[in-house]
Amino acid sequence: EKPASSLNVRFDARTMNLTWDCQENTTFSRCFLTDKKGRVVEPRVTNKECSCTFREICLHGGVTFEVHVNTSQRTFQEKLLYPNSGREGTAAQNFSCFIYNVDFMNCTWARGPKAPRDVQYFLYIQNSKRRREIQCPYYIEDSGTHVGCHLGNLSGLTSRNYFLVNGTSQEIGIQFFDSLLDTKKIERFNPPGNVTVRCNTTHCLVRWKQPRTYQKLSYLDFQYQLDVHRKNMQPGTENLPINVSGDLENRYNFPSSEPRAKHAVKIRAADVRILNWSSWSEAAEFGSDERHHHHHH
């Protein structure tokens, strides 16, 4: 039995709740988590509560919880080590996810180098408020082992989400891997759509549509690159892309006088803060193929 002086601190990884035994006449309570990076996470706790809930934490590296409670009589300080139990090197590794085509997400991982042959991995996702848990609906397998997950419904996700890969085996304990990921960092944009080029005698105007995204973004959040090149150019002649900031009406006007040779323009998009470029759009062509035309781009 625990001595009366102990707070009996315990942690529930499912709810990220740290709880302790309530003390009479508590005047002050604080709880902390310290990770191996030297990062301290401290949730709000009121004196009437004997628990706190962590949101912004990853546990797979092993963490230390700490609770400080002052009462009118004495001070309590107690630590709880939360290791990643299981054999070292058995956890899923090289974990990554990406959102694509607005509504879909793929996550992939590799089996741990020390994982036994019968290892099986399971992915759980919680939104940042920990209010909803999604279990992977469709696993990608390699020789029967889950090494990826495909989601076709992202409605439960928020701007930052918690990913947990648990493992099971009949032979040994398997360590878990967890990660917090920003949707901003993992979304791959579709290329811009409706790329059109209209030319007059002296200029050409390129227009395009902002790609639809999973995140709610404004035009200010977009950066575009335009690749305007002459058709049938010699291999090895590379054009520098033209950078254009997102605007309410996405357009780029450039001088190009008649007669003009056959050209193609393609566009790609990225988040200005991330610069993970989308693939290039379909090329839109302008100009003509007639041999006597001079290039005035």
């Epitope: 990076k37 990062r39 949101r55 912004e56 901003k184 950078n243 990225a270 991330i274 610069l275």
Partner: antibody
């Protein structure tokens, strides 16, 4: 347009505590995460930590554990940084900062800064 | 933690000249890098994010480039108001570390 306005300069004795405020206008405090960055005289910028006013969670560097408290008053849209057991090396300009898409544990660059509060620790 | 190293510590140039400031990360930070300008008695001002995207209201003489570990801030033609201290900051990995700064002074 968002603005962050900080409290005035403070002179403190070693061992004392200081509480710096950062009033937000143009947004409500709960829409933001407030980060604190300090700058010792003639030195570079040091990120201290971040605070999420919506759920009260704080993240900071271990070197500040036991000495730092970040809080917020949503009724006045004001964030606070309290630093206790002050020592001479805490003498610095303390800035609150935030930005578009800045959350508790993520920033994509701090677009908005307070004007800074000079805290001098001297016996 | 990721260490950000800026060079040179001081750069002496004249108005109208081109300035090239460097920032190196101790490990890859992808394109998660910001540049700030700080003038005496003022708070830092965000110039560049995403390594190369200009923040709102920043003149186009400021440009950023690089990814991974090596980054450059270029001021194509120095104006008198550009003389200040410049800091880079990585936001790929906690804690979000700053470089020690490059002081751009008038020659």
């Amino acid at each position: 347009q968002m603005q962050l306005v900080q409290s005035g300069a403070e002179v403190k004795k070693p061992g004392a505590s200081v509480k710096v405020s950062c009033k937000v206008s143009g947004y409500t405090l709960t829409e933001l995460s407030i980060h604190w960055v300090r700058q010792a005289p003639g030195k570079g910028l040091e990120w201290m930590g971040g605070f999420d006013p919506e759920d009260g969670e704080t993240i900071y560097a271990q070197k500040f554990q036991g000495r730092v408290t970040m809080t917020g008053d949503t009724s006045t849209d004001t964030a606070y940084l309290e630093l206790s057991s002050l020592r001479s090396e805490d003498t610095a300009l303390y800035y609150c900062a935030t930005g578009r898409y800045t959350s508790l544990a993520t920033t994509y660059g701090f677009d908005y800064w307070g004007q800074g509060t000079l805290v001098t620790v001297s016996s | 933690e990721i260490v950000m190293t800026q060079s040179p510590a001081t750069l002496s140039l004249s108005p109208g000249e081109r300035a090239t400031l460097s920032c190196r990360a101790s490990q890859s930070v992808s394109s998660y890098l910001a540049w700030y300008q700080q003038k005496p008695g003022q708070a830092p001002r965000l110039l560049i994010y995403g390594a190369s995207s200009r923040a709102t209201g920043i003149p186009d003489r400021f440009s950023g480039s690089g990814s991974g570990t090596d980054f450059t801030l270029t001021i194509s033609r120095l104006e008198p108001e550009d003389f200040a201290v410049y800091y880079c900051q990585q936001y790929d990995n906690w804690p979000y570390t700053f470089g020690q700064g490059t002081k751009l002074e008038i020659k």
